[in-house]
Interface confidence: low
Amino acid sequence: ELCDDDPPEIPHATFKAMAYKEGTMLNCECKRGFRRIKSGSLYMLCTGNSSHSSWDNQCQCTSSATRNTTKQVTPQPEEQKERKTTEMQSPMQPVDQASLPGHCREPPPWENEATERIYHFVVGQMVYYQCVQGYRALHRGPAESVCKMTHGKTRWTQPQLICTGEMETSQFPGEEKPQASPEGRPESETSCLVTTTDFQIQTEMAATMETSIFTTEYQ
């Protein structure tokens, strides 16, 4: 079941998945001046069995001006490229993604790939948030969001992360309430059905990650 919406946006924060649940799709997008080859896949799909998951299909881009296809990097589940920015606010252990059954790693780049990756997440997917460079986490609760099924519809849980500029003074001494309390949202969020998630990956986020932002182009 695909998630209807994108994960919530948090001011001055980015999110990424540490691993992608089977069923996740990644659009084959090409950068300006390039396009998918005519017979090329529209998307990559995370598929697998009980012991191994990998990305099906491969994305290929060709110059809009020529008919020659560019070299293609075939996604390998062993490879991993993290796209995230800034240091974590608190040290945590990195996730061994090979130990997460039913999940695919971050696909490696393909030549002339677009600057932004567009994923289509499935129910049960978890994404993690951290503040962008120049901002720090204030009074952080769960800096993650999970796509859950509720009354036949999907929703993302609200990440309880507030990012403030380094020079700003904290308005959260002690246990004061965060601005627009992320938990006191007006919409109804009572669930009829949820899928359980892997708690291990909820709490074991990488302590250091490469400083290329989640949606930023590859060098």
Epitope: V146, P182, P186, E187, S188, E189, T190, S191, V194, F199
Partner: nanobody, 127 residues
Framework: EVQLVESGGGLVQAGGSLRLSCAAS????????MGWFRRAPGKEREFVAA????????LYAGSVKGRFTISRDNGRNMVYLQMNSLKPEDTAVYYC????????????????????WGQGTQVTVSS
């Protein structure tokens, strides 16, 4: 693996008090929203109370409001349910639950929203 262990249940007379405790381990406790549910004999599991990760939001079922108080101690990885003025209809198995769902002030969570559960502790209120 998250583990929740309840304690503090027992037999008490109507009008008495009990304090239930829930010890959490195996995960980052301070980032969880915690709740108490109960199941009376022959009935569905029902929501009792919940507390948000930073204790800025507490919710109670109408039947326990004013009598029960939920609290948590992030330093000790504990959640508590103080139950006063107990009634025979409070007799049930009480379960501690955890998840990172947001708490909405106008809706009570249902049991299916919580992914992590304890084994429960029996509370019996005699008349």
């Amino acid at each position: 693996e998250v583990q929740l262990v309840e304690s503090g249940g027992g037999l008490v007379q109507a009008g008495g008090s009990l304090r239930l405790s829930c010890a959490a381990s195996g995960g980052t406790f301070r980032t969880r929203n915690m709740g108490w549910f109960r199941r009376a004999p022959g009935k569905e599991r029902e929501f009792v109370a919940a507390v948000s990760w930073n204790v800025d939001n507490k919710l109670y079922a109408g039947s326990v409001k004013g009598r029960f108080t939920i609290s948590r101690d992030n330093g000790r990885n504990m959640v508590y349910l103080q139950m006063n003025s107990l009634k025979p209809e409070d007799t049930a198995v009480y379960y501690c639950a955890a998840d990172n769902i947001p708490l909405s002030s106008d809706m009570r969570p249902t049991a299916t929203e919580y992914d992590y559960w304890g084994q429960g502790t029996q509370v019996t209120v005699s008349s």
